[in-house]
């Protein structure tokens, strides 16, 4: 039975040209995290394998930095980066947990972080 929950940074906003950290945290389970995949709609951004390290998709290699931790840093943001991002936790023995983050990249200099929320 899957008992875990993923806490994410929720709905977040950032300035064009700036950077943002995408973070998820898996709690309420003793399952071992073997890998976290970071995806944007239908695109793979990065993979963090607990043992093998990081894979960064070449399409994003100049704008994506691994970490902190299992998180992902997006740099040189553009308005086209606005959208849904998913952290997919591969765990043993539970299986897969998915968290969702919505990022809005703003033209203006006023970019405030939204509230944190949980996805079961």
């Amino acid at each position: 039975m899957m008992t875990g929950t993923i806490e994410t940074t929720g709905n977040i906003s950032a300035e064009k040209g700036g950077s943002i950290i995408l973070q998820c945290h898996l709690s309420s389970t003793t399952a071992q995290v073997t890998q976290v995949n970071w995806e944007q709609q239908d695109q793979l951004l990065a993979i963090c394998n607990a043992d093998l390290g990081w894979h960064i998709s070449p399409s994003f290699k100049d704008r994506v930095a691994p970490g902190p931790g299992l998180g992902l840093t997006l740099q040189s943001l553009t308005v086209n980066d606005t959208g849904e991002y998913f952290c997919i936790y591969h765990t043993y023995p539970d299986g897969t947990y998915t968290g969702r983050i919505f990022l809005e990249v703003l033209e203006s200099s006023v970019a405030e972080h939204g509230a944190r929320f949980q996805i079961p």
Epitope: T34, N37, D42, D51, H55, S57, H90
Partner: antibody, heavy 119, light 107 residues
Amino acid sequence: QVQLVQSGAEVKKPGASVKVSCKASGFTFTGRTIHWVRQAPGQGLEWIGGFNPNSGGSSYNQKFKGRATLTVDKSISTAYMELSRLRSDDTAVYYCARSSYYRFDLDYWGQGTTVTVSS
Amino acid sequence: DIQMTQSPSSLSASVGDRVTITCKASQDVKTAVAWYQQKPGKAPKLLIYSASFRYTGVPSRFSGSGSGADFTLTISSLQPEDFATYYCQQHYTTPWTFGQGTKVEIK
């Protein structure tokens, strides 16, 4: 230039163990993960697992967990794959390969080590 | 485990032909796919990474495409040195798995 040089062919009896070495040169050994892939005669490729010399972490194909042990000796830039309780269907060519920087494809391969298991 | 199914398992072609090899994953693997070429008695060589990126030194006649579960390796004009076996590999999740191979033979 990047090189992965493997140890020579081995002939083993069923139930025995084999340890294959892979000597790396031409790159920073601790910066790349070393993987092991095998190929039975006339068959396709099968991933055994990978070892990250930097973190000391290893990932195994469950099929080989408990029989395969991946290690490294950083002082001599050498990776090892030991396979125990050998069976005849372990007869194969065993390759070591290096994963690319921040990528999970295998960009350089050793020449292969033939392991024959026969009574 | 994710299964990678290649087709065809073998094909006969002539120098100059356009050759297409397909690889189907048993689940969505996004673009986490590489293609390798292997000649008899030799180790595999990386051709394409992340589904569509040509590896350093690989001739431009080799191209890769696809995303999700369906991937293609294309050789635009087959050369004598291209007769070999080709494998796809997924690294979306462990265990990494390979297709069974496609042998490209001389017609």
